[in-house]
């Protein structure tokens, strides 16, 4: 039975040209994480494999940095980066957990950042 929950940064906004941390945290389960995938709509941004670590998709290598933790840092943001991001936790014995984050990239310098989520 899947008892875990994924906490995310929720809906966040950031300035064009800036950077943002996408963060998810799996809690309320003793399941072991085998791999975490980060996806933007249908595109894979990165994976973090429990054995082999971080692998950033070649098409995003210049603008995506691993971490902190199992989170992902997006850099040099453009308006086209606006949209849904998903963290997909592959675990055993539970199976797969998915978290959703909506990022809005604003032209304005008054972008209101969502509260930064910290893994305890």
């Amino acid at each position: 039975m899947m008892t875990g929950t994924i906490e995310t940064t929720g809906n966040i906004s950031a300035e064009k040209g800036g950077s943002i941390i996408l963060q998810c945290h799996l809690s309320s389960t003793t399941a072991q994480v085998t791999q975490v995938n980060w996806e933007q709509q249908d595109q894979l941004l990165a994976i973090c494999n429990a054995d082999l670590g971080w692998h950033i998709s070649p098409s995003f290598k210049d603008r995506v940095a691993p971490g902190p933790g199992l989170g992902l840092t997006l850099q040099s943001l453009t308006v086209n980066d606006t949209g849904e991001y998903f963290c997909i936790y592959h675990t055993y014995p539970d199976g797969t957990y998915t978290g959703r984050i909506f990022l809005e990239v604003l032209e304005s310098s008054v972008a209101e950042h969502g509260a930064r989520f910290q893994i305890p």
Partner: antibody
Framework: QVQLVQSGAEVKKPGASVKVSCKAS????????IGWVRQAPGQGLEWMGW????????NYAQKLQGRVTMTTDTSTSTAYMELRSLRSDDTAVYYC??????????????????WGQGTMVTVSS | DIQMTQSPSSLSASVGDRVTITCRAS??????LNWYQQKPGKAPKLLIY???SLQSGVPSRFSGSGSGTDFTLTISSLQPEDFATYYC????????FGGGTKVEIK
């Protein structure tokens, strides 16, 4: 076509080291992990560990920790497995194998679809 | 480490028979299980991944099922080329193999 070609058979003395190579062709080497599996004569398959050809990170079977080193040379699309302080019970056929899933497929890594032909390593005094 | 126990260790069957091999994990591994076929002197060949997905190019008479701790490989109608040894392997760290099941001609 996609293939892995391993180096030839080796005969080693106890205490020596062996380095087996595994040359990949027919696919993008840095997009898939490489695993190593061995099989003692008449026995089953034993997982040794694996390496990411993308970032060089490794994970080894606990039993072999400290004696095994896996590396890759991306310029030649070749993976290597070195085993040190050889003992008679290291006598086995050593296989390299490509992960069935690309890092960019989003699938969980772990199955192996393309295997080398195997390298027989005999440890004998 | 998670232990993988295969049964039976060997079996005798005839061409056309339905053959079932089981693999039990010492703790739940969700669907992270693969099946391989190995013939004497040859490298293993991937048949089934993620418990039930048929690897490309593998005949449809092979099927896999199960999740959690109990898994099954079924050959619906055994063919002469299917006489071999079959191994399960779990895909969670540290990716151990079962002991193998040798399928022999009756």
């Amino acid at each position: 076509q996609v293939q892995l070609v391993q180096s030839g058979a080796e005969v080693k003395k106890p205490g020596a080291s062996v380095k087996v190579s595994c040359k990949a062709s027919g696919y993008t080497f840095t997009s898939y992990p490489i695993g190593w599996v061995r099989q003692a004569p008449g026995q089953g398959l034993e997982w040794m560990g694996w390496i990411s050809s993308y970032n060089g990170n490794t994970n080894y079977a606990q039993k072999l920790q400290g004696r095994v080193t896996m590396t890759t040379d991306t310029s030649t699309s070749t993976a290597y497995m070195e085993l040190r302080s050889l003992r008679s019970d290291d006598t086995a056929v050593y296989y390299c194998a490509r992960g069935a899933s690309s890092f960019w497929s989003g699938d969980v890594l772990g199955a192996f679809d393309i295997w080398g032909q195997g390298t027989m390593v005999t440890v004998s005094s | 480490d998670i232990q993988m126990t295969q049964s039976p260790s060997s079996l005798s069957a005839s061409v056309g028979d339905r053959v079932t091999i089981t693999c039990r994990a010492s703790q739940s591994i969700s669907s992270y299980l693969n099946w391989y076929q190995q013939k004497p002197g040859k490298a293993p060949k991937l048949l089934i991944y993620a418990a039930s997905s048929l690897q490309s190019g593998v005949p449809s008479r092979f099927s896999g099922s199960g999740s959690g701790t109990d898994f099954t490989l079924t050959i619906s109608s055994l063919q002469p080329e299917d006489f071999a040894t079959y191994y399960c392997q779990q895909s969670v760290p540290p990716r151990t193999f079962g002991g193998g099941t040798k399928v022999e001609i009756k």
